[in-house]
């Protein structure tokens, strides 16, 4: 008899979850030799204990406690690039600006970046059919604790100016229940951070508006000042352009407002 | 090329108030707040606090909350270091550095004196 | 507040020698693997001019003679080789947190 399984309302665990995590892992590690001591079944069993046998919608902090601790990893702290709905770009730029790291430049956020997994109270088996949704089920579920945990650390050791790119195509360009707004806004440090610097990413080739002035942007703005931290804001009107200058800066037309 | 540029020594009496500026240029000033250290005649170096030159918001380490008061003018890139009811331990040079601490004025020498 | 011990007080050395200054902090300045301590050398006159920032990252125009080393609470600031135009005095800052704190500094003379 086929034993009763609790359906939630997101997708289940990535195919292949622990052989992608495996082989990320010694991807990772192979490419990025300040990682090589890391010991990656090690890892997979640090992240496995985070979420097998238990609950999927009472997960905490501290279940990946182990697996943070095994993925500790020092970035320039002056090197930060956050971002909020507009991933693909942010990865474009550091992968050509490579002094610089989003979060899933890192082990941690690279291991599990695009992917899914929950797993079942007491039994150690991984839930492929479904997992619960944020808002739909639960909020403590083993993803979103994840990436608000590695959320949290990265903001946390910035320091110098944070860059942070915004998508200037939606509706909420600051959206505070993002994961920026709702975590690493609140997680950089006054003391270490001087400035934290928004790249408004515009969407339409003949946006000229000044989406700075943007009202969502004056609520981050207000969110930042009354952190003590500084802010500032610029529209990047022409990103194709911009990822160009990155690449080239000396080119001629680099010279001009991107 | 970055510069914090302050105002000339001060000779003050006990009790009196003295201004000091310290005006930056080749930065965005409004980005980076700003730090103001002490340093009396043979002595260490002794941080006061900042300014959020965004906002204004002053921070005061606690022996400089009081008679010390930082304050800006944004419109000329400068920011303020006030102090009230001069005492004879005022007796320094003071120096803005923005927030960082690459880049010092060079410095302002308070002289208190009867 | 974070206490900073500098020593020495004060050291003379031989041009073309090794020298190193530490400083020791009350507890750690340590923050996810970056270590807020900064080093700077005054001249009579002149305002601090930052030599090494993060402990160990020598600051734009910085000749190579100085480095920085050192985690958690204990620092290393070495000059290597000593030249005349580093007679100073050096002091260490800790920026992790607030109150932000200096060594009471070390004064180099030249042998």
């Known amino acids: 008899v086929p034993r009763w399984r609790q359906q939630w309302s997101g997708p289940g665990t990535t195919k292949r979850f622990p052989e992608t995590v495996l082989a990320r892992c010694v991807k990772y590690t192979e490419i990025h030799p300040e990682m090589r001591h890391v010991d990656c079944q090690s890892v997979w069993d640090a992240f496995k204990g985070a979420f097998i046998s238990k609950h999927p919608c009472n997960i905490t902090e501290e279940d990946y406690q182990p697996l943070m601790k095994l993925g500790t990893q020092t970035v320039p702290c002056n090197k930060i690039l956050l971002w909020s709905r507009i991933k693909d770009l942010a990865h474009q730029f550091t992968q050509v600006q490579r002094d610089m790291f989003t979060l899933e430049d890192t082990l941690l956020g690279y291991l599990a970046d695009d992917l899914t997994w929950c797993g079942e109270f007491n039994t150690s088996k991984i839930n492929y059919q479904s997992c619960p949704d944020w808002r739909k089920d639960c909020s403590n579920n083993p993803v979103s604790v994840f990436w608000k945990t590695v959320s949290r650390r990265f903001a946390e050791a910035a320091c110098d100016v944070v860059h942070v790119m915004l998508n200037g195509s939606r509706s909420k360009i600051f959206d505070k229940n993002s994961t920026f707004g709702s975590v690493e806004v609140h997680n950089l440090q006054p003391e270490k951070v001087q400035t934290l610097e928004a790249w408004v990413i515009h969407g339409g080739r003949e946006d000229s508006r000044d989406l700075c002035q943007d009202p969502t942007i004056k609520e981050l703005e207000s969110i930042i000042s009354k952190r003590n931290i500084q802010f500032s804001c610029k529209n990047i009107y022409r990103p194709d352009k911009f990822l160009q200058c990155v690449k080239n800066p000396e080119d001629s037309s680099c010279t001009s407002e991107i | 090329q970055i510069q914090l540029v302050q105002s000339g020594p001060e000779l003050k009496k006990p009790g009196e108030t003295v201004k000091i500026s310290c005006k930056a240029s080749?930065?965005?000033?409004?980005?980076?707040?700003m730090n103001w250290v002490k340093q009396a005649p043979g002595k260490g170096l002794k941080w006061m606090g900042w300014i959020n030159t965004y906002t204004g918001e002053p921070t005061n380490a606690d022996d400089f909350k009081g008679r010390f008061a930082f304050s800006l003018e944004t419109s000329a890139s400068t920011a303020y270091l006030q102090i009230n009811n001069l005492k004879n331990e005022d007796m320094a040079t003071y120096f803005c550095?923005?927030?960082?601490?690459?880049?010092w004025g060079q410095g302002t020498l308070v002289t208190v004196s009867a | 507040d974070i206490v900073l011990t500098q020593s020495p007080a004060s050291l003379a050395v031989s041009l073309g020698q090794r020298t190193t200054i530490s400083c020791r902090a009350s507890?750690?300045?340590?923050?996810?693997?970056?270590?807020?301590m900064h080093w700077y050398q005054q001249k009579p006159g002149q305002p601090p001019k930052l030599l090494i920032y993060?402990?160990?990252n020598l600051e734009s125009g910085i000749p190579a003679r100085f480095s920085g080393s050192g985690s958690r609470t204990d620092f290393t600031l070495t000059i290597n080789p000593v030249e005349a135009d580093d007679v100073a005095t050096y002091y260490c800052?800790?920026?992790?947190?607030?109150?932000?704190?200096f060594g009471s500094g070390t004064k180099l003379e030249i042998k």
């Open positions: 993060r402990a160990s």
């Open positions: 080749g930065y965005t000033f409004t980005n980076f707040g």
């Open positions: 800052q800790q920026i992790n947190e607030d109150p932000f704190t």
């Open positions: 550095a923005r927030k960082g601490f690459a880049y």
């Open positions: 507890e750690s300045v340590d923050s996810y693997g970056n270590s807020f």
